[in-house]
Interface confidence: low
């Protein structure tokens, strides 16, 4: 039962994270939550950083600054793969949830 619950939590978290990405950066509250998650867990996007390419409100050559290894204003614009966290947040935060929830 515990595993089923954990999988459900992961699935819900994945869906919720992707929904929040769709609202980025239009919704300031959503943006701050995602930015905090990405910066704290050193991750970018749901599955990986390329998820941001699919977000209509984000220009194609951009990820949130919170994806950067060294976060500075505008660092996500014209980013280079070496300068950002490439690992997805769902797996990374999910691992933390599995250990702590």
């Amino acid at each position: 039962a515990g595993y089923v619950f954990r999988d459900k939590v992961m699935s819900e978290f994945n869906n919720n994270f992707r929904q929040q990405m769709e609202n980025y950066p239009k919704n300031n509250h959503t943006a701050s939550i995602l930015d905090r998650m990405q910066a704290d867990f050193k991750c970018c996007g749901a599955a990986n950083y390329t998820d941001w390419e699919k977000i209509p409100s984000m220009s194609k050559n951009r990820v949130p600054d919170s994806c950067c290894i060294n976060v500075t204003v505008g660092c996500g614009i014209n980013f280079n793969e070496k300068a950002i966290h490439k690992e997805g947040c769902v797996e990374k935060i999910g691992g933390w949830l599995r250990k702590n929830v």
């Epitope: 050559n61 014209n78 280079n80 793969e81």
Partner: antibody, heavy 117, light 108 residues
Framework: QVQLQESGPGLVKPSETLSLTCTVS????????WNWIRQSPGKGLEWIGY??????NYNPSLRSRVTISEDTSKNQFSLKMSSVTAADTAVYYC????????????WGQGTMVTVSS | EIVLTQSPGTLSLSPGERATLSCRAS???????LAWYQQKPGQAPRLLIY???SRATGIPDRFSGSGSGTDFTLTISRLEPEDFAVYYC?????????FGQGTKVEIK
């Protein structure tokens, strides 16, 4: 695979406006940064500017004379340079800036523009 | 603007030899935003290296890039006949984006 093709007059008179078009095939102009770069014997390779979803960035040395715009319906972007002189004689390239690498990963073959009366 | 100075202007080498090309910036460039291009006569430049050391798609592993700050290097480990060309470095971290003046690698 994205391909780029420049087109426009090869000869422009001094003080007139240079107009070039770059046609994008194999990809949407709605993605990426679309650049103009020129190469002359005197100045080497010189970045002119880019357009990205109608937002632009120009080289300050050319900004007062340059307009880069895009036509999404035709999947094209264009360069207009006013008040040209002989110093603007060069090979003009259009180039795509890639997602994740951000260098100029795809180039057109270039078009020679001569400014002369 | 950031001025990129390439050296030497011309490099005369034989096929099979190692080529080392230098690019020096007038101010610090993030290594994430330094590229190298190859250009042959009558052709457009071709991207070789981006992010100072990442090879572009389809570029053979004899091409490698390194460096940080103001000093960057392009190395061709063993020159093939098709490698004789002009090589340019370029920075795209600070607008306006700028190119070096080029290094010509010619057959000795």
């Amino acid at each position: 695979q994205v391909q780029l093709q420049e087109s426009g007059p090869g000869l422009v008179k001094p003080s007139e406006t240079l107009s070039l078009t770059c046609t994008v095939s194999g990809g949407s102009i709605s993605s990426y940064y679309w650049n103009w770069i020129r190469q002359s014997p005197g100045k080497g390779l010189e970045w002119i500017g880019y357009t990205k979803k109608r937002s632009t960035n120009y080289n300050p040395s050319l900004r007062s004379r340059v307009t880069i715009s895009e036509d999404t319906s035709k999947n094209q972007f264009s360069l207009k340079m006013s008040s040209v002189t002989a110093a603007d004689t060069a090979v003009y390239y259009c180039a795509k800036m890639g997602w994740g690498s951000h260098a100029f990963d795809i180039w057109g073959q270039g078009t020679m523009v001569t400014v002369s009366s | 603007e950031i001025v990129l100075t390439q050296s030497p202007g011309t490099l005369s080498l034989s096929p099979g030899e190692r080529a080392t090309l230098s690019c020096r910036a007038s101010q610090s460039v993030s290594s994430s935003y330094l590229a190298w291009y190859q250009q042959k006569p009558g052709q457009a430049p071709r991207l070789l290296i981006y992010g100072a050391s990442s090879r572009a798609t389809g570029i053979p592993d004899r091409f490698s890039g390194s460096g940080s700050g103001t000093d960057f290097t392009l190395t061709i480990s063993r020159l093939e006949p098709e490698d004789f060309a002009v090589y340019y470095c370029q920075q795209y971290g600070s607008s306006p984006w700028t190119f070096g003046q080029g290094t010509k690698v010619e057959i000795k």
